[in-house]
Interface confidence: medium
């Protein structure tokens, strides 16, 4: 019995659902009563899911697996794995027995995008040309381990004096911290690129250091020019710094973070002490760094509703302020593709192909193409609906008239993360059958 699975690993984002495709060719007169289907972990032989004696025997794998019962009779033995975790990565074997038996193994490659790196500088005040500084580039919650590259402002690679560490959390996701030690010139830009080698996703940030004293008078408050991009559910640091003068003490400092538009108080430090969070108890300062001029704000468990501009007010004798933008993002899941009608298809038939991708932010851009990469723009209807958390589910519907055969692919792009998720469906045969291709 010939059992077919994809040659390439199935790549799935952590937290999304993955389909491990497996198919066989049923003979005429085949009935499900004859079918024994077993999915198991290739290495340990642990049972994952089975179908026997005409019945789905259910999931033996943390209750996160399902078959496609309506498609079994057509030879589709694929397994749906829900809420993928890092620990799911590996090889799954699909055993099919009717009279004969056959098996094939499919690899699941788990991935998670890395957050936009945050950059910190130590020391971060009174810098002069010739000083040695430590620049730390931190990016969070990615998988598998990242590749990290440093460059200067002219694109020259910086490979000496770089130390990179990657630490996995309980979920197996990596936080990467890369430290560059440099001797400052008159001024300089230092950029860090964190790549996810599976997703070929690049996250990068840069810091420009101008080692000169700020003019006397108003307090010069510095924040990043670019929006801080934070993934939903992760923590974000809204960087803000000032240059304390010699003899400065925290008793002199008034620091206020507020929402730029509504002036709602977020967090404050006055009278020599942290006055705490006035923003859903999800903010914190960096108390040990305040005396060095680091007035940054940590915002925990970022939500879509947090998106917007935050103003950092610093008052010592004089005062200064600057606003930093928070851009919230969430990656879209790999699209699922459905076909209507999905049987007895012939050239000339009109079919509706639906591409659905879930829980992303901000709204996605959706592109359709045929198997030659030709864009399909006519007869496409895309709707995006936000859930209670403000995350979007996108459903894009393509109506096409079938040719002799055809591949139709849908690409869902997160415009902030520049993250692409795509699915495709190939329709072949007379009468036509359909199957998913996952790239």
């Amino acid at each position: 019995l010939e059992v077919q699975v994809p040659e390439d690993p199935v790549v799935a984002l952590v937290g999304t659902d993955a389909t491990l495709c497996c198919s066989f060719s049923p003979e005429p007169g085949f009935s499900l009563a004859q079918l024994n289907l077993i999915w198991q972990l290739t290495d340990t032989k642990q049972l994952v899911h089975s179908f026997a004696e005409g019945q789905d025997q259910g999931s033996a794998y943390a209750n996160r697996t399902a078959l496609f019962p309506d498609l079994l009779a057509q030879g589709n033995a694929s397994l749906r794995l829900q809420r993928v975790r890092v620990a799911d990565e590996g090889s799954f074997t699909c055993f099919v027995s009717i009279r004969d038996f056959g098996s094939a193994a499919v690899s699941l490659q788990v991935a998670a995008p890395y957050s936009k790196p945050s950059m910190t500088l130590e020391p971060n005040k009174d810098l002069r040309p010739g000083d040695t500084v430590t620049i730390t580039c931190s990016s969070y919650q990615g998988y598998p381990e990242a590749e990290v590259f440093w460059q200067d402002g002219q694109g020259v690679p910086l490979t000496g004096n770089v130390t990179t560490s990657q630490m996995a959390n309980e979920q197996g996701l990596f936080d990467v911290h890369s430290i560059l030690r440099v001797v400052l010139g008159a001024n300089g830009t230092y950029s860090c690129l964190v790549r996810n080698p599976v997703l070929q996703q690049d996250a990068h940030s840069s810091v420009t250091i101008t080692p000169q004293r700020s003019p006397t008078g108003a307090v010069e408050v510095q924040v990043p020019e670019d929006p801080v991009v934070a993934l939903v559910g992760t923590d974000a640091t809204l960087r803000c710094s000032f240059s304390p003068e010699p003899g400065f003490s925290l008793a002199q400092l008034n620091l206020i973070w507020q929402l730029t538009d509504t002036k709602q108080l977020v967090h404050s430090f006055t009278e020599g002490r942290d006055q705490g969070s006035a923003y859903a108890n999800r903010t914190a300062l960096f108390p040990d760094l305040l005396a060095q001029g680091n007035a940054s704000l940590r915002l925990q468990r970022v939500r879509v509703a947090d998106e917007g501009s935050f103003t950092c007010f610093v008052s010592i004798r004089d005062f200064g302020s600057a606003a930093v933008s928070l851009q919230v993002a969430a990656p879209y899941s790999k699209p699922s593709m459905t076909l209507e009608p999905n049987k007895d298809l012939r050239p000339g038939d009109t079919v509706t192909i639906t591409c659905s991708s879930y829980r992303g932010y901000p709204e996605a851009e959706v592109f359709w193409q045929d198997g030659q990469g030709v864009p399909l723009t006519g007869n496409v209807t895309t709707s995006q609906m936000a859930n209670e958390q403000g995350l979007f589910d996108v459903h894009s519907v393509l109506r096409v008239v079938l040719g002799a055969n055809g591949t139709y692919s849908c690409l869902v792009r997160n415009p902030v993360l520049q993250q692409d998720a795509h699915g495709s469906v190939t329709i072949t045969g007379q009468p036509m059958t359909h199957h998913h291709h996952h790239h």
Epitope: E147, F149, Q151, V156, P157, H204
Partner: antibody, heavy 121, light 106 residues
Framework: EVQLVQSGAEVKKPGSSVKVSCKAS????????IHWVRQAPGQGLEWIGY????????DYNQKFKDRTTLTADRSTSTAYMELSSLRSEDTAVYYC??????????????WGQGTTVTVSS | EIVLTQSPDFQSVTPKEKVTITCRAS?????MNWYQQKPDQSPKPWIY???NLASGVPSRFSVSVSGTDHTLTINSLEAEDAATYYC?????????FGQGTKLEIK
């Protein structure tokens, strides 16, 4: 129009030196690094090194480090490559090129027309 | 040193044919650039930052990446594509080029 214009062809004796110039126009000369690349007859491209005209920082391919000097004159927006102790295998076309782009993606967007250096006794 | 190995060295192709050129890096690179060079001309930027087409480059050119393999594809070759193509990296010193792939039209 952004341009790099190189000096003319040179014929040199083994053991001598050659200095090739590359005059930049149409952009701020100090904003980008200038690289030198050579191509021997019928062969591929080989990187010699670069100079940052602003800081005058240089870096060289180890293979050329002992025999090459890269300089830049900001007043005339001209970069120079001097190669000493010439031997016959240094016969090649020498190109200057601007390394341009934006963080973190850079590439050689403008090339000079090339200077043919022939080393022959 | 990161060594870039292009394959094939030479390819003779008929117009309208699909062509692939692979550039394999000996270790990970931050990004790859590609240049086109025709006889007696300076190289021209062709593809930068792994997969972005330089100005004026036709859309029949594309690049895909798998691990350290970067594959340049021309999906329907035209006569004007006859040239030598070089890949280039500068993730670490020294900056290196591939040895080049020469495309000839049959």
């Amino acid at each position: 129009e952004v341009q790099l214009v190189q000096s003319g062809a040179e014929v040199k004796k083994p053991g001598s030196s050659v200095k090739v110039s590359c005059k930049a126009s149409g952009y701020s000369f100090t904003s980008y690094t200038i690289h030198w690349v050579r191509q021997a007859p019928g062969q591929g491209l080989e990187w010699i090194g670069y100079i940052n005209p602003n800081s005058r920082n240089t870096d060289y391919n180890q293979k050329f480090k002992d025999r090459t000097t890269l300089t830049a004159d900001r007043s005339t927006s001209t970069a120079y490559m001097e190669l000493s102790s010439l031997r016959s295998e240094d016969t090649a076309v020498y190109y200057c090129a601007r390394y341009s782009g934006s963080t973190p993606y850079w590439y050689f967007d403008v090339w000079g027309q090339g200077t043919t250096v022939t080393v022959s006794s | 040193e990161i060594v870039l190995t292009q394959s094939p060295d030479f390819q003779s192709v008929t117009p309208k044919e699909k062509v692939t050129i692979t550039c394999r890096a000996s270790s990970s690179v931050s990004y790859m650039n590609w240049y086109q060079q025709k006889p007696d001309q300076s190289p021209k930027p062709w593809i930068y930052a792994t997969s972005n087409l330089a100005s004026g480059v036709p859309s029949r050119f594309s690049v895909s990446v798998s691990g350290t393999d970067h594959t340049l594809t021309i999906n329907s070759l035209e006569a004007e594509d006859a040239a030598t193509y070089y890949c280039q990296q500068w993730s670490s010193n020294p900056l290196t080029f591939g040895q080049g792939t020469k495309l000839e039209i049959k």
